[in-house]
Interface confidence: low
């Protein structure tokens, strides 16, 4: 007869490991007992369990409650055992020794490999600001056994670098994603992808990029200067900018306080019916936590009567 087993048994942390050992004997042969032991190099054998044809299963104290026979029906020639709830410390070499009658003893070895799936973590880098050079956007760390693979999935242009730290029973892999921040990256996803043989599917952690910036400010509303005449209603100036975080707006007048009746509503400056008092230099001040910008415009309120008088003069002069 001969023993049938596996060279390597692989389980994920916390799963039950079936350690196979089947005696394929000739007819009339019987298995008296099967002894399982852990036999790592450099250490003495440590008994797991004894399967006795007459007395049944005896589990050594070190494995009490952790070693079982597979559920019925059982073949009397099957010496396989279940090691419950595999932990990293279980990884190593195991031996089954089968005592048969009348053929004698046989032994076989297998290696138990316990995969420890990673629990990845993603850490954003320092605050990203437009104008910075190459900057750390995020780092992703995953520890497992064997070492996990850490990659990035993103539309954003950047560079990656990885480093690995070996521990006694596992390895930690850290990958960093660096980029040159630009406002177009705002809201873009940066996804850390962790692959590992102990995972049914890749694990993904997504970080949404936030890049601080502040666009140049400009003022709209003076495109047609002729509309800014005495008596006109609904005149307004609008300050244009964009930023991350969203900016706040402040209006001032360079050559004095804002005239009475002028309403400030965020980015908009609303005027009452125009008078010559409203002529002046107006400044829009845009700011966020990242930066601040100014834009100034000159408002010149026209007096239509003065203009028509001038026109008459011009006509008569011709």
């Amino acid at each position: 007869g001969e023993l049938e087993t596996s060279d390597v048994v692989t389980v994920v942390l916390g799963q039950d490991a079936k350690l196979p050992c089947f005696y394929r004997g000739d007819s009339g042969e019987q298995v008296g007992q099967v002894a399982w032991a852990r036999v790592d190099a450099g250490e003495g054998a440590q008994e797991l369990a004894l399967l006795h044809s007459k007395y049944g299963l005896h589990v050594s104290p070190a494995y009490e409650g952790r070693v079982e026979q597979p559920p019925p029906p059982r073949n009397p020639l099957d010496g396989s055992v279940l090691l419950r709830n595999a932990v990293q410390a279980d990884e190593g070499e195991y031996e089954c020794r089968v005592s048969t009658f009348p053929a004698g003893s046989f032994q076989a070895r297998l290696r138990l490999r316990v995969l420890v799936p990673p629990l990845p973590s993603l850490n954003p880098g320092p605050a990203l600001e437009e104008g910075q050079g190459l900057t750390l956007a995020a780092s992703c760390t995953a520890e497992g056994s064997p070492a996990p693979s850490v990659t990035w999935d993103t539309e954003v242009k950047g560079t990656t670098s990885s480093r690995s730290f070996k521990h006694s029973r596992s390895a930690a892999v850290t990958s960093e994603f660096h980029l040159v921040p630009s406002r177009s990256m705002n809201g873009q996803p940066l996804t850390c992808v962790v692959s590992h043989p102990g995972l049914l599917q890749d694990q993904r952690i997504t970080h949404i990029l936030h890049v601080s910036f502040l666009a140049e400010a400009s003022v709209r509303g003076l495109e047609d200067q002729n509309l800014w005449h005495i008596g006109r209603e609904g005149a307004m100036l609008k300050c244009l900018s964009e930023g991350q975080p969203p900016p706040s707006y402040n209006w001032t007048r360079l050559d004095g306080p804002l005239p009475s009746g002028v309403r400030v509503d965020g980015d908009t400056l609303g005027f009452p019916p125009l008078t010559t008092e409203h002529s002046g230099i107006y400044v829009c001040h845009v700011s966020n936590e990242f930066s601040s910008r100014d834009s100034q415009v000159t408002v010149d309120v026209l007096d239509p009567q003065e203009d028509s008088g001038k026109q008459v003069d011009l006509v008569s002069a011709s």
Epitope: Q46, P61, A62, E64, G65, R66, N85, V87, A89, S168
Partner: antibody
Framework: EVQLVESGGGLVQPGGSLRLSCAAS????????MSWVRQAPGKGLEWVSG????????RYADSVKGRFTISRDNSKNTLYLQMNSLRAEDTAVYYC???????????????WGQGTLVTVSS | DIQMTQSPSSLSASVGDRVTITCRAS??????LAWYQQKPGKAPKLLIY???SLQSGVPSRFSGSGSGTDFTLTISSLQPEDFATYYC?????????FGQGTKVEIK
Amino acid sequence: EVQLVESGGGLVQPGGSLRLSCAASGGSFYGFGMSWVRQAPGKGLEWVSGIYSHDADKRYADSVKGRFTISRDNSKNTLYLQMNSLRAEDTAVYYCARQTEDRSYGYDLDYWGQGTLVTVSS
Amino acid sequence: DIQMTQSPSSLSASVGDRVTITCRASQGISSYLAWYQQKPGKAPKLLIYAASSLQSGVPSRFSGSGSGTDFTLTISSLQPEDFATYYCQQHYTTPPTFGQGTKVEIK
């Protein structure tokens, strides 16, 4: 049969230090995680700290974190608990116990010592 | 931390009685539960592990059942040596936590 014997308990003033030892004999020590569990007079059981077989992974209850340090010497089959900055509420019988598996975070405890009394009082 | 709540906190029973103690976890702990017996002045003794497995050398009158959040320790026929305090303990997460104990007294 595994035997665990604690020592090192006694009376100490608040703010003082003690080092408890737990000597194992009669069975495997290296291949197992070990824990310290305490019991204040007339109270229930409270897990204090646990250690993996190879000394790399150590865990602590929040109530002792930063004050107590667990360690082991596998060559001497001995477990230790260094207790610093002791408080009145640390008064208890301290048991060392062997875990049925080599994991520092939990697992049922199959062998226990007889305990050693630590009294923190001025 | 996971809270373990035992009930009752104490009970009186006679030799030969069937005694049931329950333990409830504040969140699911699968079968990561152990039961211990403690007599005055002595260390706790493991009775049941993995919620329902009898520790070697423990009399078969002790049994455990349950999974998830609700667990039960049953003593089928109380013996004089069973008068003690019983604790449940979860070890699903760190820190492992114990129930407050159930004292079984002679009626």
